[in-house]
């Protein structure tokens, strides 16, 4: 499914992607009167540093070698932040003393940018993406994708790390954004809503699809994540909205199928290797493309987001096992892991097609 | 030294039964799958059986499947092929290999052990 | 007969270059899965010479090297030496059979 870009030919539901429209304070729910379940903010854990929280964990990137068994990675740390379905907050929780990011969580306090300042910049995402408001950009080609096919062995490593669901990702998979602009991924995760609740962190005039999946890379001029952290184009997230479609995804199936064994918070399982990109819309050419943030602590910038404009289809009870499977810190489900909506504050989203 | 070595091949009759070890050591076993792969006389490579790292998912190529199992016990960083109901066709060196390069390639092999099956 | 299709025998004069393919299909190679190639001397086991269509093991001279496009791969040897006479096998996964196939096998020959 595709997102419309005029407003005449369409009601949201099919595509997947938005425009360039920061979300005014109404989105933003306060503090108080922010729900635990609403939007909470968070994004992607970068892997790295232990004491580099992100987007959701980050795995550490090390050079090249013959016998890369598996690609350590270091859960960055976690922060939660109180939400609304659809209007998340920008809060965390710090369970430790001192500049830790690595508890936080959904909706609670302290706010976000005590957790990490960066959270409070001026670039930060998601954002409402408005098709109409979108600058066409012929420059922006279609991307590419390499080796993202992976065999079933070595598995991979499947983890609830108590703010999403994430799946590291081995040496080897390239991105290109086009010429120059190179990328290895790292880690895949998901945002979700709840039983009847969207839960996508982007949303496209304002329609909040019912989930998101991001996957996360780094700049192939730098070697670790926390170089990258905060410089423009060190990393890029690849975001595609999921919506409900009436057949069962057979590529997201593989990952689903495993959600029970991973419902604690913390715990991990092993998956067989599968297509990454098949987990991915299959038109790589149309997207829009804008320079933010991760959605977590530490909300760092210059982080280049590309949204896809087609969607991503599973089936209902596939969303279903998605929003209602996993737990968090507590007793908590972990339900509702988006981030608020962010202000553009002048910056305007580019569209690969007119 | 990071190396595999092999033990259990000789002759058996068709229909017979055979067990392969395969003792790992110089790397972490325990964290690699690792396949059996054989090469019949003057004949080319072909790919057996595999098993993750913690032996919960294995896989098998057709010509072997329901008469080959494939097991590992990670505590003696051994892996095993257990072959029932042999064939003259099963005749070949058997290979084994460590699973471990993301990409599917299998960078450490056993010297391999030579399992004829003849009446 | 393999999925895999390699040339049974290629061969070069010392100092030359030679190259070896493998050609696949849209359930292998042309579906993305790496190709990976393989070195068998005589007698000995295989060695692990080129993975991920292009990386060469440490250890592995740099007149080998690896290339893939659409659903065939190759290897190149530059400079070629008398210790280079072996078997190589080239080798991907194959999504349809579910299965890690070897080519058949090309003999290398130094005159």
């Known amino acids: 499914q595709r997102l419309p870009r005029m407003q005449e030919d369409s009601p949201l539901g099919g595509g997947s992607s938005g425009e360039d429209d920061p979300l005014g304070e109404e989105d933003l729910p306060s503090e108080e009167d922010s729900p635990r379940e609403e939007d909470p903010p968070g994004e992607e854990d970068l892997p790295g540093e232990e004491d580099l929280p992100g987007e959701e964990d980050l795995p550490e990137v090390k050079p090249k070698s013959e016998e890369e068994g598996s690609l350590k990675l270091e859960d960055l740390p976690t922060v939660e932040a109180p939400g609304d379905p659809q209007e998340p907050q920008n809060n965390a929780h710090r369970d430790k003393e001192g500049d830790d990011q690595s508890h936080w969580r959904y909706g609670g306090d302290p706010p976000w940018p005590r957790v990490s300042p960066a959270c409070a910049g001026r670039f930060q995402s998601p954002v409402d993406i408005r098709p109409q408001l979108a600058a066409f950009c012929p420059a922006l080609r279609p991307l590419e994708l390499l080796g993202f096919q992976l065999p079933p062995l070595p598995e991979l490593r499947l983890r609830n790390n108590g703010h999403s669901v994430q799946l590291t990702l081995p040496p080897g998979l390239e991105m290109a954004l086009g010429p120059g602009r190179e990328y290895r991924a790292l880690q895949l995760h998901l945002h979700w809503g709840a039983a009847g609740r969207p839960g996508s962190e982007h949303t496209v005039e304002g329609h909040r699809f019912p989930a998101e999946i991001h996957v996360v890379h780094l700049s192939t001029a730098f070697a670790r994540v926390d170089e990258a952290l905060g410089r423009p184009g060190g990393l890029a997230v690849l975001a595609a909205f999921l919506e409900e479609g009436p057949e069962e995804n057979s590529a997201y199936e593989q990952l689903l199928s495993r959600l029970e064994e991973i419902a604690e918070e913390g715990s991990e399982t092993q998956v067989p290797g599968l297509d990454i990109s098949a987990l991915l819309p299959s038109d790589f050419s149309r997207y829009f493309q804008y320079e933010g943030s991760l959605t977590t602590p530490p909300c760092a910038q210059g982080v280049i987001w590309t949204v896809f404009n087609q969607t991503v289809m599973l089936s209902a009870k596939q969303l279903h096992t998605l929003s209602d499977t996993l737990w968090g810190p507590g007793d908590s489900r972990l339900q509702l892991n988006f981030r608020a909506t962010q202000p553009l504050n002048g910056r305007v989203i580019e569209a690969s097609f007119p | 030294q990071v190396q595999l070595v092999q033990s259990g091949g000789g002759l058996v009759q068709p229909g017979g039964s055979l067990r392969l070890s395969c003792a790992a050591s110089?790397?972490?076993?325990?964290?690699?799958?690792m396949s059996w792969v054989r090469q019949a006389p003057g004949k080319g490579l072909e790919w057996v059986s595999a098993?993750?790292?913690?032996?919960?998912?294995?896989y098998y190529a057709d010509s072997v499947k329901g008469r080959f199992t494939i097991s590992r016990d990670n505590s003696k960083n051994t892996l095993y092929l257990q072959m029932n109901s042999l064939r003259a066709e099963d005749t070949a060196v058997y290979y084994c290999?460590?699973?471990?390069?993301?990409?599917?390639?299998?960078?450490?092999w056993g010297q391999g052990t030579m399992v004829t099956v003849s009446s | 007969q393999s999925v895999l299709t390699q040339p049974p025998s290629v061969s070069g004069a010392p100092g030359q270059r030679v190259t070896i393919s493998c050609t696949g299909s849209?359930?292998?190679?042309?579906?993305?899965?790496?190709v990976h190639w393989y070195q068998q001397l005589p007698g000995t086991a295989p060695k692990l010479l080129i993975y991920?269509?292009?990386n060469r093991p440490s250890g592995v001279p740099d007149r080998f090297s690896g290339s893939k496009s659409g659903t065939s791969a190759s290897l190149a040897i530059i400079g070629l030496q008398a210790d280079d006479e072996a078997d190589y096998y080239c080798q991907s996964y194959d999504s349809t059979l579910r299965v890690w196939m070897f080519g058949g096998g090309t003999k290398l020959t130094v005159l």
């Open positions: 991920g269509n292009t």
């Open positions: 849209s359930s292998n190679i042309g579906a993305g899965y790496d």
């Open positions: 290999a460590n699973n471990g390069n993301y990409r599917g390639a299998f960078d450490i």
């Open positions: 098993i993750s790292a913690n032996g919960g998912t294995t």
């Open positions: 110089g790397f972490p076993f325990s964290s690699y799958a």
